[in-house]
């Protein structure tokens, strides 16, 4: 199709080489509040273009994204050629940064309902650059945490080194939806709730003498509880003895609950005590079996192919640790009678 009639938007993604960050493109027209509509081509010079829905009730969820190769080749369907780019409804998610993401991206509805809808498309010219200047050493992260129940703020990474007074007007989105009355470079949250979690996008316009473009940054906001003040507790095994059958295989499970920590380095391991000797056992990897805002339950099993007489003289110890401290639980095997 002919893309010359598409509305055009220029975007700049300046990524930090120090951190993982994502980027998004919205299939929208220049004005955010018109994101569900499209100008028809004029039928005659006297007729005013009217707003018509792109997709009727489907609300733009059924759009097609293309990339325009720089060598003039035909448009390429994003889904077929770019595994690091994911389409979610009318949003294109770039999972990894890199200058190779620079280019022209075109979106339009899959269903063209009339010949006048052909110009119902948006062309986004994306320029991707690594951050070069070290002038802003403490720029805001693309991953920001808000502590539940307390006051916090969400900063636009590309503007976090500017004072509020000199900051340009910012357009904010949350999970792809326009936050129409948030326009400063930093959003203050007086009391943090779980619904403040999400993907925030901040846009502002930058211009030079020739043209203007939108500078965009994506911030993943996580709502968290305060770091735990407790060491982990072992939920299983509860008993310190376990009845077993000699010659049979045995799996002993250690389940431990770890309170939330922003920097989370849980340790869960099995070791064996035999008289004065003690050694760690190589066992299958630990796995998280339940995760909530407040805590995580992690399990690690020790597997004995065959219970021997020698195992009855040993103690099997589960050791768990976080930054606060450690806990152990030992199990002595006992032969099942009868």
């Amino acid at each position: 199709f002919n893309i010359s009639g598409c509305s055009t938007k220029k975007l700049l993604w300046t990524y930090s080489t120090r951190s993982e960050e994502e980027f998004v493109l919205f299939c929208d027209l220049p004005e955010p509040q018109k994101s569900h509509f499209c100008h028809r081509n004029r039928l005659s010079p006297k007729q005013v273009p009217e707003h018509l829905p792109f997709m009727g009730s489907n609300d733009l969820s059924d759009v097609q994204w293309y990339q325009q190769p720089s060598n003039g080749d035909p448009l390429e369907d994003i889904r077929k050629s770019y595994p690091h780019i994911i389409q979610d409804k009318c949003t294109l998610h770039f999972l990894t940064p890199g200058v190779n993401n620079s280019g022209s991206y075109i979106c339009r509805p899959k269903m063209i309902k009339s010949p006048y809808d052909v110009a119902c498309c948006v062309k986004m010219i994306l320029e991707v650059k690594p951050q070069t200047n070290a002038s802003c050493e403490y720029s805001a992260s693309h991953k920001q945490d808000l502590l539940l129940g307390s006051t916090g703020s969400i900063s636009c990474p590309s503007l976090s080194c500017q004072s509020d007074a000199q900051s340009p007007a910012v357009t904010w989105y949350k999970n792809g939806k326009l936050l129409s009355v948030e326009r400063s470079n930093r959003i203050v949250v007086d009391e943090v709730y779980d619904y403040h979690q999400g993907t925030y996008v901040c846009d502002y316009t930058q211009s030079d003498t020739v043209s203007s473009w939108t500078v965009r940054a994506v911030v993943q906001v996580r709502t968290i509880v305060g770091d735990t003040k407790l060491k982990p507790d072992i939920l299983d095994p509860v008993e310190d003895t376990l009845e077993v059958e000699l010659g049979k295989p045995l799996t002993i499970s250690c389940k431990a609950r770890f309170g939330f920590e922003r920097v989370f380095n849980p340790v869960i391991k099995w070791y064996i005590k035999d008289s004065d000797l003690e050694w760690e056992v190589s066992v299958p990897e630990a796995k998280s079996i339940k995760s909530t805002l407040k805590d995580e339950i992690i399990e690690r099993n020790i597997i004995l192919e065959k219970v021997t007489q020698r195992d009855l003289r040993r103690k099997f110890v589960c050791f768990v640790q976080n930054s606060i401290g450690n806990t152990t639980q030992s199990v002595q095997l006992k032969e099942k009678r009868g």
Partner: antibody, heavy 123, light 107 residues
Framework: QVQLVQSGAEVKKPGASVRVSCKAS????????MHWVRQAPGQGLEWMGI????????TYAQKFQGRVTMTRDTSTSTVYMELSSLRSEDTAVYYC????????????????WGQGTTVTVSS | DIRMTQSPSSLSASVGDRVTITCRAS??????LNWYQQKPGKAPKLLIY???SLQSGVPSRFSGSGSGTDFTLTMSSLQPEDFATYYC?????????FGGGTKVEIK
């Protein structure tokens, strides 16, 4: 308890302006957006716009663009809605209504409403 | 703008009846739908938000359902104090828009 108290009834002539106030109490004023909604006699509800009390940022319904101005005074926890170039069709009860969730939020619902201010436009 | 169409515009019912009001959006609004109750001379009162969440203090006989374009408010057993006008409202995008209202009258 959370309360929104609005200014009293107004009678205005066509072409004039009216300013309605809404004083908030019982919560942190800057934490919640404020909406303005009007209701003409015997008619339904019509959303006019929203203000973020923290920065004073506003969004207005297209229908009122150019005629409505929403402002706030954080020192008195009060929001104001001014409507200019009044015409007879602007005769209505005007409500302020607090957004239900702490900002920033996509709009969730208006959980507390003022008692309403009757504005009558008549020559 | 997103148009919200409510039906019926009015209905007559008796105490104890199960009453259902529907609301249709002109485009998909996910679950961004709220329901309000308004009595004559009073301000509206929020009943349901996010299509199906009950606002605190609202009796459990009120329930909401639906997503996308079609939504329903149900009153499982109508009480004398429930005779009022009910409005749906989308909060998907500005301008926020209301349905035309459904007046629930005593039969």
């Amino acid at each position: 308890q959370v309360q929104l108290v609005q200014s009293g009834a107004e009678v205005k002539k066509p072409g004039a302006s009216v300013r309605v106030s809404c004083k908030a109490s019982g919560y942190t004023f800057t934490s919640y957006y404020m909406h303005w909604v009007r209701q003409a006699p015997g008619q339904g509800l019509e959303w006019m716009g929203i203000i973020n009390p923290r920065g004073g940022y506003t969004t207005y319904a297209q229908k009122f663009q150019g005629r409505v101005t929403m402002t706030r005074d954080t020192s008195t926890s009060t929001v104001y809605m001014e409507l200019s170039s009044l015409r007879s069709e602007d005769t209505a009860v005007y409500y302020c209504a607090k957004e239900g969730r702490v900002s920033p939020t996509d709009y969730y619902g208006m959980d507390v409403w003022g008692q309403g201010t009757t504005v009558t436009v008549s020559s | 703008d997103i148009r919200m169409t409510q039906s019926p515009s009015s209905l007559s019912a008796s105490v104890g009846d199960r009453v259902t009001i529907t609301c249709r959006a002109s485009q998909s609004i996910s679950s961004y739908l709220n329901w309000y109750q308004q009595k004559p001379g009073k301000a509206p009162k929020l009943l349901i938000y996010d299509a199906s969440s009950l606002q605190s203090g609202v009796p459990s006989r009120f329930s909401g359902s639906g997503s996308g374009t079609d939504f329903t408010l149900t009153m499982s057993s109508l009480q004398p104090e429930d005779f009022a006008t009910y409005y749906c409202q989308q909060s998907y995008s500005t301008p926020l828009t209301f349905g035309g209202g459904t007046k629930v009258e005593i039969k």
